[in-house]
């Protein structure tokens, strides 16, 4: 950090300001040195003596050039659902962030105050919007022709396999089951397939575009910390 060379306090010229890394002391009516990050003012300046700075004690810090009488206390230790991404030092506060599989439900200036587990979409529902550091997963019901058979915070709805002959039709939570003749896997939810008789296809004949059409938007789940809603599980 930039070094501050000690000097006798001085009265600024009329219309002039103190230099950078200095402050105007109203009592002394002098420009005085600030203390560097990691320090605080032990003794304030006078007309004849400059600020006396001292190092911050353990578990306290100052991040900025300052003339505060006491250093700030570092935040409390990170909770079990958090990881410490920045340790408490004399120059910086501890920063806690959410561990994988969790998101920040209540943030603070730096890091996170409260973490919550990412919502898991139950079978029949897939991830519409993945979780981020600061937002929960949004689940949606699997559209016709797609399914999800997992309880997951990452799995999306996948297309049913296309059967030459269907043994068991697929639904929102289960893939189609084909008879012993080898199936051809649909490549994408909206893939267009060659026409064939209805009886030889999976349960749905019309490819469905993703994301699903307007009526299913009512199933989008709210953001933020909330009790498990339809399509999600707290497990």
């Amino acid at each position: 950090l930039p070094a501050q060379v000690a000097f006798t306090p001085y009265a600024p010229e009329p219309g002039s300001t103190c230099r950078l890394r200095e402050y105007y002391d109203q009592t002394a009516q002098m420009c005085c040195s600030k203390c560097s990050p990691g320090q605080h003012a032990k003794v304030f300046c006078t007309k004849t003596s400059d600020t006396v700075c001292d190092s911050c004690e353990d578990s306290t810090y100052t991040q900025l050039w300052n003339w505060v009488p006491e250093c700030l206390s570092c935040g409390s230790r990170c909770s079990s659902d958090q990881v410490e991404t920045q340790a408490c030092t004399r120059e910086q506060n501890r920063i806690c962030t959410c561990r994988p599989g969790w998101y920040c439900a209540l943030s603070k200036q730096e890091g996170c105050r409260l973490c919550a587990p990412l919502r898991k979409c139950r079978p029949g529902f897939g991830v519409a919007r993945p979780g981020t550091e600061t937002s929960d997963v949004v689940c949606k019901p699997c559209a016709p022709g797609t399914f999800s058979n997992t309880t997951s915070s990452t799995d999306i709805c996948r297309p049913h396999q296309i059967c030459n002959v269907v043994a068991i039709p697929g639904n929102a939570s289960m893939d189609a089951v084909c008879t012993s003749t080898s199936p051809t896997r649909s490549m994408a939810p909206g893939a267009v397939h060659l026409p064939q008789p209805v009886s030889t296809r999976s349960q749905h004949t019309q490819p469905t575009p993703e994301p699903s059409t307007a009526p299913s938007t009512s199933f989008l789940l709210p953001m933020g910390p909330s009790p498990p809603a339809e399509g999600s599980t707290g497990d």
Epitope: L1, P2, S16, R21
Partner: antibody, heavy 118, light 108 residues
Framework: QVQLQQSGAELARPGTSVKLSCKAS????????MQWVKQTPGQGLEWIGA????????RYIQKFKGKATLTADKSSSTAYMQLSSLASEDSAVYYC???????????WGQGTSVTVSS | QIVLTQSPAIMSASLGERVTITCTAS???????LHWYQQKPGSSPKLWIY???NLASGVPARFSGSGSGTSYSLTISSMEAEDAATYYC?????????FGAGTKLELK
């Protein structure tokens, strides 16, 4: 390594405003003052002011009060200078420079050329 | 404010020649806060000498600086082609910081 990346050249009409940026990397942005300097062929190098991104404290010389406004965005480590009510005499190259030991400007941006013309 | 006067404004020097550029302050300046910058056409200034006599990183040892009070100087012991540039002195002993008008050093 420390780098200061300034925004591209500006061509502006008299009376309008421009906002120049200076993106810092390679050091703790909030711990160092960022200074701004104007350079013209006639006037040479002229200090405009400085900002401390840590707390937003800013200083200006009298001549540039009301002309220049310094801001800083901690999240993107970027310092900004807005120049308002532009006139032909504001045409210059503007530099951002980091305040280092003993108030020496130890790292400089590449400069942004501002041309004010009708 | 403190006015810095550089001399000469322009000068030419031959390869190997000793070069001295001076910077005179209108009032006394602490040597700690007197600096020099080098600038080449189309480039930004570079810190060259800080606190009167300390060479910035990468500056060749043929450069030196000295002075106190109101009189400061930058010296090149043996001019080289790459030294052709404009040199500025700068003070931040008191606000506002000020610069000299520059000395343009050309290769003869």
């Amino acid at each position: 390594q420390v780098q200061l990346q300034q925004s591209g050249a500006e061509l502006a009409r008299p009376g309008t405003s421009v906002k120049l940026s200076c993106k810092a990397s390679g050091y703790t942005f909030t711990s160092y003052w960022m200074q701004w300097v104007k350079q013209t062929p006639g006037q040479g190098l002229e200090w405009i002011g400085a900002i401390y991104p840590g707390d937003g404290d800013s200083r200006y010389i009298q001549k540039f009060k009301g002309k220049a406004t310094l801001t800083a965005d901690k999240s993107s480590s970027t310092a900004y200078m807005q120049l308002s009510s532009l006139a032909s005499e504001d045409s210059a190259v503007y530099y951002c420079a980091r305040d280092g030991n003993y108030y020496a400007m130890d790292y400089w941006g590449q400069g942004t050329s501002v041309t004010v013309s009708s | 404010q403190i006015v810095l006067t550089q001399s000469p404004a322009i000068m030419s020097a031959s390869l190997g020649e000793r070069v001295t550029i001076t910077c005179t302050a209108s009032s006394s300046v602490s040597s700690t806060y007197l600096h020099w910058y080098q600038q080449k056409p189309g480039s930004s200034p570079k810190l060259w000498i800080y606190s009167t006599s300390n060479l910035a990183s990468g500056v060749p040892a043929r450069f030196s600086g000295s002075g106190s009070g109101t009189s400061y100087s930058l010296t090149i012991s043996s001019m080289e082609a790459e030294d052709a540039a404009t040199y500025y002195c700068h003070q931040y002993h008191r606000s506002p910081p000020t610069f000299g008008a520059g000395t343009k050093l050309e290769l003869k």
